[in-house]
Interface confidence: medium
């Protein structure tokens, strides 16, 4: 069965720093989302080989990509306190598959010592349930419009 390996499980960074999240799969996917979980889960990026990636407006100019959709590293720059949260990779396949999640803790520089990651992965209860019987993602309320690519980037 298709799986998504995601790392790190957790990372603590000061305001203004960057973080790398890596999503690896065994291939055979159409594209990959990075979603920020919460009461209103929000898509942060969508990446597909051969197409200019799209990024949510809140992260405009703060995201870089390296690798391919099968082994993708997403770099989030200039992190803000409001970026704290759990981010999960979602591979779009015939049945959508989720990574284990990355907890990103953004702290004020002087309080770094108070907030540390444990070695345990994010709790499974924080992850969305995979869709049942459908390859479509669950509907959600988007809180911001994306920053779409130039029209010439379409396949």
């Amino acid at each position: 069965a298709q799986e998504v390996q995601q790392s790190p499980h957790c990372t603590t960074v000061p305001v203004g720093a960057s973080v790398n999240i890596t999503c690896s799969t065994s291939g055979g996917l159409r594209g990959i989302y990075l979603r920020q979980l919460g009461p209103q889960p929000q898509d942060i990026i969508y990446y597909e080989d051969g197409v200019v990636p799209t990024t949510d407006r809140r992260f405009r100019g703060r995201i870089d990509f390296s690798g391919s959709q099968d082994n993708l590293t997403i770099t989030m720059h200039r992190l803000q306190l409001s970026d704290t949260g759990t981010y999960t990779c979602q591979a779009i396949t015939e049945v959508n598959v989720y990574g284990s999640g990355t907890l990103v803790l953004v702290t004020e520089e002087q309080s770094q010592g108070w907030h540390r990651c444990s070695d345990a992965p994010p709790r499974a209860s924080a992850l969305p349930a995979p869709p049942t019987g459908s390859a479509l993602p669950d509907p959600q309320t988007a809180s911001a419009l994306p920053d779409p690519p130039a029209a010439s980037a379409l396949p």
Partner: nanobody, 124 residues
């Protein structure tokens, strides 16, 4: 329940024009991505154009750029596809779609709701 209803399809000569309409009902579409796709027998649905309802930002497939124009009328909750300089290869069933994800606007899996489709036939 969201409902999308296309209209405006038909038979037209190459070089002619058609305007498709998609009437949306069942909720407020202000935060939605709306799109047009087309499909010919034995092939997957192909992205044609998309519009973000709030911002009005529009995106087109290379094959229709400069010939097709997507727009929407907020007061009527209706989306349009103006198709000019039609070619025989534009012959297909055209579907309108609506979704809330939006980052993969050229992909069918970003759309939650679909119309029944309207046939467009371009004769040479």
């Amino acid at each position: 329940q969201v409902q999308l209803q296309e209209s405006g399809g038909g038979l037209v000569q190459a070089g002619g024009s058609l305007r498709l309409s998609c009437a949306a009902s069942g909720r407020t579409f202000s935060d939605y991505l709306m799109g047009w796709f087309r499909q010919t027998p034995g092939k997957e649905r192909e992205f044609v154009a998309a519009i973000y309802w709030n911002a009005g930002s529009t995106y087109y497939a290379d094959s229709v750029k400069g010939r097709f124009t997507i727009s929407r009328d907020n007061t009527k909750n209706t989306m349009y596809l103006q198709m000019n300089s039609l070619k025989p290869e534009d012959t297909a069933v055209y579907y309108c779609a609506a979704g809330q994800r939006g980052l993969a606007y050229a992909r069918t899996y970003d759309y939650d709701y679909w119309g029944q489709g309207t046939q467009v036939t371009v004769s040479s």
